[in-house]
Amino acid sequence: SIPWNLERITPPRYRADEYQPPDGGSLVEVYLLDTSIQSDHREIEGRVMVTDFENVPEEDGTRFHRQASKCDSHGTHLAGVVSGRDAGVAKGASMRSLRVLNCQGKGTVSGTLIGLEFIRKSQLVQPVGPLVVLLPLAGGYSRVLNAACQRLARAGVVLVTAAGNFRDDACLYSPASAPEVITVGATNAQDQPVTLGTLGTNFGRCVDLFAPGEDIIGASSDCSTCFVSQSGTSQAAAHVAGIAAMMLSAEPELTLAELRQRLIHFSAKDVINEAWFPEDQRVLTPNLVAALPPSTHGAGWQLFCRTVWSAHSGPTRMATAIARCAPDEELLSCSSFSRSGKRRGERMEAQGGKLVCRAHNAFGGEGVYAIARCCLLPQANCSVHTAPPAEASMGTRVHCHQQGHVLTGCSSHWEVEDLGTHKPPVLRPRGQPNQCVGHREASIHASCCHAPGLECKVKEHGIPAPQEQVTVACEEGWTLTGCSALPGTSHVLGAYAVDNTCVVRSRDVSTTGSTSEEAVTAVAICCRSRHLAQASQELQ
Amino acid sequence: EAPEHGTTATFHRCAKDPWRLPGTYVVVLKEETHLSQSERTARRLQAQAARRGYLTKILHVFHGLLPGFLVKMSGDLLELALKLPHVDYIEEDSSVFAQ
């Protein structure tokens, strides 16, 4: 019978044993930075090469007894999860192991840095196909470890790491907090976050997705044919490293940004019970469980987008928060969110030649988040058009006036502490879809993009009486690029995209005593690329 | 050669006290620093430390990913190290764990 975890990552229409061919991932090399490993275990023999790299601290304690099978336990199991012949995800992937963790599973930031440098030098000396680096370890937040991961990622290497097993915000740990790294949390057979003793999987905005990480059957270092069940975010990360190897083997030219977008796109959505997470982390934590794509030849025709949350701005009056897209992603829209509702909106602005999303806190606010919608849009030329506050009763409007440019997102930002209630008489005049509309006291920012074959449409869902949540989703074949609220009044906490759905949150009506005048509309901008669709048809 | 005007190198350490490894530091140099400059900066630190009666040991010189070096030294020398040319920041070593 197939282990639950392999079943879970297999697309519904396939059997796991058919779907995971013995040569899956064969064009990819996976580096594992972990404990020593038993590379002649039947599950992994011939699949894993032990490099001569070793940089580990001495074991703690005077009476520590170094038992080989214990020393090898963690690394052997993970190598088996990635590429094991019976219980591995990418059975054809070849692996190289570096020892950076001692027999107690402990290493150092410096040893890990030297290991990453070793990989970079190996890559320069003997360039091979796509490289995946699996970092099934975590320490406290480290600027230098994150920087090294960033450099390696920019050299074309895909890094996958464990979110951490501390039942805490993954942003407090490294390399989990490095934006360039694919950070993986752990779920169980019931798609629930994994509990590990009194702790459990980390969570939060620094997690990219979750993957199976409880009771995972894999190679045991107790004997050359033994298996054992292990749990943790390391096991979850190993699944994603295996999935990445499969995807890169099918499409070796994929960039890190493309791979991350595909991992998110093909994940199972909204299956995790968010009640397990602390309340303030639920909105920030992706409800995604990794899965293999339904076919081995890519999905190049798709317009892929993901949501990136900023760090919390902090509560000071002028505090701002910035959300950034990856270097080869386009920022197509920007929104903001505040639990207290006290915010001054958001704007897209250029920073270092790239657009970023900046959200503004308001006086008395507990802080804001900026939420960027980051998309893969080849040959895109995007710009921001701004209209200052109109002060007129009609509200502020801005549209994309350049030929061939389409509206992908609307943002609004205001200097006043509290926007009065305001309901524009006409939300959007017919025949003007390329237009953003907002409060008369707000500046409105339109994200306007030109890209081959890009078409977008506006979809609205308004509710007459205020509700805590209003949503609107894009239909099949369309991708959500923009999500905003109309009007931008004070009882609106903010707007954000969850997968292909635009969510607008308002304050609890019972506590605010709002009137029915303050209707809330969720505005989604849905786009698709005819160019990408045609290109993929030509390839097939 | 003094550090560039107006840029102050910063010191970082792990927020989780039990995971700190004082006595070992990663000295990260500015992005375009060459290997020879890294080695020179490391030697300069050793020489200046020796003049103050401190022993230091260069454990590794980084190049390929980040320019810099790993040094075993007393925390008393941090102020001195932060003033070295080309230094961007210094981070105290810390533990990582299998997850």
Partner: antibody, heavy 115, light 107 residues
Framework: QVQLVQSGAEVKKPGASVKVSCKAS????????ISWVRQAPGQGLEWMGW????????NYAQKLQGRGTMTTDPSTSTAYMELRSLRSDDTAVYYC????????WGQGTTVTVSS | DIQMTQSPSSLSASVGDRVTITCRAS??????LDWYQQKPGKAPKLLIY???TRPSGVPSRFSGSGSGTDFTLTISSLQPEDFATYYC?????????FGQGTKVEIK
């Protein structure tokens, strides 16, 4: 290139012991164990067991019934298979092969048990 | 232990012929089946692993197929150097077990 070179032919009396060696080269020995397979005259192939260069762990076929011992000496990249209390039906060609996958084989060592 | 049964136990064929040898396992072995070629006085040589994968250096005229319990080795166009004994071996469980062999002789 991968090579497994075995020791020469042996003639033994019933009840005696034999120790066959297999020297590995051309690959990283710790990444693979060594399997031992025998073939009686005119017969098929029979797997006897496996031994690790990495930690000396073994995995024996039940049929050996404690008569066989497999060892390795990583310093010389050599694996050994010792068979005790030899019987006439142990007469066979003994092969070593790389790992459980048995993708490369030694040339074989003929062991003849005869009174 | 898993029993492996090969058929036929021997066959006569001419150069250029297409030859098929079958192997049946006593229980499902997924795709964990290897094929070996052995010439008189020589060690076996791995021809096919995991039912259908050819190691580098093995001519493309050799191909393997099947999964579960039934497997086939096909030689698309028999060459003079292909006259030998062929063994299947299951790699699913320990101990690995071999078929009794199929001897391919010149007609």
């Amino acid at each position: 290139q991968v090579q497994l070179v075995q020791s020469g032919a042996e003639v033994k009396k019933p009840g005696a012991s034999v120790k066959v060696s297999c020297k590995a080269s051309g690959y990283a020995i710790y990444n693979y164990g060594i399997s031992w397979v025998r073939q009686a005259p005119g017969q098929g192939l029979e797997w006897m067991g496996w031994v690790s260069f990495y930690n000396g762990n073994t995995n024996y076929a039940q049929k050996l019934q404690g008569r066989g011992t497999m060892t390795t000496d990583p310093s010389t990249s050599t694996a050994y298979m010792e068979l005790r209390s030899l019987r006439s039906d142990d007469t066979a060609v003994y092969y070593c092969a790389r790992g459980y996958v048995m993708d490369f084989w030694g040339q074989g060592t003929t062991v003849t048990v005869s009174s | 232990d898993i029993q492996m049964t090969q058929s036929p136990s021997s066959l006569s064929a001419s150069v250029g012929d297409r030859v098929t040898i079958t192997c049946r396992a006593s229980q499902s072995i997924n795709n964990w089946l290897d094929w070996y070629q052995q010439k008189p006085g020589k060690a076996p040589k791995l021809l096919i692993y995991a039912a259908s994968t050819r190691p580098s250096g093995v001519p493309s005229r050799f191909s393997g197929s099947g999964s579960g319990t039934d497997f086939t080795l096909t030689i698309s166009s028999l060459q003079p150097e292909d006259f030998a004994t062929y063994y299947c071996q299951q790699d699913q469980d320990i101990p690995p077990t071999f078929g009794q062999g199929t001897k391919v002789e010149i007609k």
